[in-house]
């Protein structure tokens, strides 16, 4: 799979295979993996991938089941480099500030929050 | 403060502390903190906060600032509260693959993804 | 590498209102490690900062500016705007848009805006 | 506001260094960024956080701040150093920037 193809346009095509092959997938009944209780998807990456990597193992590989798995590992590439981005830019306390509002103002608007 | 106040109010009035204590915690002219690159901030909540606690030990406390903090560090509570939820429940796959859709769903629709 | 380029009008007639807009290309102007800055330079003069944005819509202007200036920013499209009102001949100038993450990083060429009627 | 003050022109002959100075309260204790700018061209950072020089501008170029003059100095003058020089800070109780009036540099000869 070239990596050149847009983020964006690889996540479209991974939501179709994952439709496409979503019998075969179910087809094993006794695997359990954990699935998160709440909608904030950001904060459970690593799950969500860990989950991926358990259902790959117990998966028979070939033809496009196994481009599934690697575009999804692909996203996982890009999302390990997005959290790279979070400490790179050291910047006034500023800036800084302005972040952490729009953050709070984010999870205050968007945000599944339950008390 | 009391941790009954339920976590959209506690955010609500965090941003309008932020506002108010804003002059006195830019006044530090060369501290540098870490600042996210993009805007997909639950990705970055481990630096925003290591930035707040950068912050915190370098502004004089006292007064509703200690509570600016504290409340900040009731909604890491929070937060590190939603990433143990991200593991706990073992479902089946097609459990899993429904949160996967819905994840690759969001990612499709709402996150800023730059190639 | 981050290009920046102004566009706009270069005559404007005094009273009304200067519009200029920058166009970010080679970079995100969602980067939350930049804010998105208006300077000017009259003739022969030395620069002037007019105020910064950051993606989220937070603004800062110069004091001396702040009742006449509106500074945008359209992230669908990675453009920033400036609007000037109520414009007279001491507005004639280059005018710059910059990104500013510590210092300013990069520039536009710089466009000149000349208020004559 | 906070205000800085640079001498309208400075004027050096080849191989000799430079001074130019940037004056403002206290301003030892801010940050302070210098920009090059030659006719018709938009201005280029040449020292930053005193004293730091970005990758590409030559060694000659130096930077030092205390008390409430902060410098920038230019060894070996060359040529084509000659342009006008800006100083900037951040004006922190604000969060503003600041520009001092920029220093015309001549190099003589």
């Known amino acids: 799979i070239p990596t050149e193809i847009p983020t964006s346009a690889l996540v479209k095509e991974t939501l179709a295979l994952l439709s496409t092959h979503r019998t075969l997938l179910i087809a094993n009944e006794t695997l359990r993996i954990p699935v998160p209780v709440h909608k904030n998807h950001q904060l459970c990456t690593e799950e969500i991938f860990q989950g991926i990597g358990t259902l790959e193992s117990q998966t028979v590989q070939g033809g496009t089941v196994e481009r599934l798995f690697k575009n999804l590992s692909l996203i996982k590439k890009y999302i390990d480099g997005q959290k790279k981005k979070c400490g790179e830019e050291r910047r006034r306390v500023n800036q800084f500030l302005d972040y952490l509002q729009e953050f709070l103002g984010v999870m205050n608007t968007e945000w599944i929050i339950e008390s | 403060i009391p941790t009954e106040i339920p976590t959209s109010a506690l955010v609500k009035e965090t941003l309008a502390l932020l506002s108010t204590h804003r002059t006195l915690l830019i006044a530090n002219e060369t501290l540098r903190i870490p600042v996210p690159v993009h805007k997909n901030h639950q990705l970055c909540t481990e630096e925003i906060f290591q930035g707040i606690g950068t912050l915190e030990s370098q502004t004089v406390q006292g007064g509703t600032v200690e509570r600016l903090f504290k409340n900040l560090s009731l909604i890491k509570k929070y937060i590190d509260g939603q990433k143990k939820k991200c593991g706990e429940e073992r479902r089946r796959v097609n459990q899993f693959l429904d949160y996967l859709q819905e994840f690759l769903g969001v990612m499709n629709t709402e996150w800023i993804i730059e190639s | 590498q981050v290009q920046l380029q102004e566009s706009g009008p270069g005559l404007v007639k005094p009273s009304q209102t200067l519009s200029l807009t920058c166009t970010v290309s080679?970079?995100?102007?969602?980067?939350?490690?930049?804010?998105w800055s208006w300077i000017r330079q009259h003739p022969g003069k030395g620069l002037e900062w007019i105020g910064y944005i950051y993606y989220s819509g937070s603004t800062y202007y110069n004091p001396s500016l702040k009742s006449r200036v509106t500074i945008s920013v359209d992230t669908s499209k990675n453009q920033f705007s400036l609007k000037l009102s109520s414009v007279t001949a001491a507005d004639t100038a280059v005018y710059y848009c910059?990104?500013?993450?510590?210092?300013?990083?990069?520039w536009g060429q710089g466009t000149l805006v000349t208020v004559s009627s | 506001s906070y205000v800085l003050t640079q001498p309208p022109s400075v004027s050096v002959a080849p191989g000799q260094t430079a001074r130019i100075t940037c004056g403002g309260n206290?301003?030892?204790?801010?940050?302070v960024y210098w920009y090059q700018q030659k006719p018709g061209q938009a201005p280029v950072l040449v020292v930053h956080?005193?004293?730091d020089r970005p990758s590409g501008i030559p060694e000659r170029f130096s930077g030092s701040n205390s008390g409430n003059t902060a410098t920038l100095t230019i060894s070996r003058v060359e040529v084509g150093d000659e342009a006008d020089y800006s100083c900037?800070?951040?004006?922190?109780?604000?969060?503003?920037?600041?520009f001092g009036g920029g220093t015309k540099l001549t190099v003589l000869g």
């Open positions: 900037q800070v951040w004006d922190s109780s604000s969060a503003h920037v600041v």
């Open positions: 206290n301003i030892g204790s801010k940050n």
């Open positions: 956080d005193d004293s």
């Open positions: 910059a990104s500013l993450g510590n210092w300013f990083d990069y």
């Open positions: 080679g970079g995100s102007i969602s980067n939350g490690g930049y804010y």
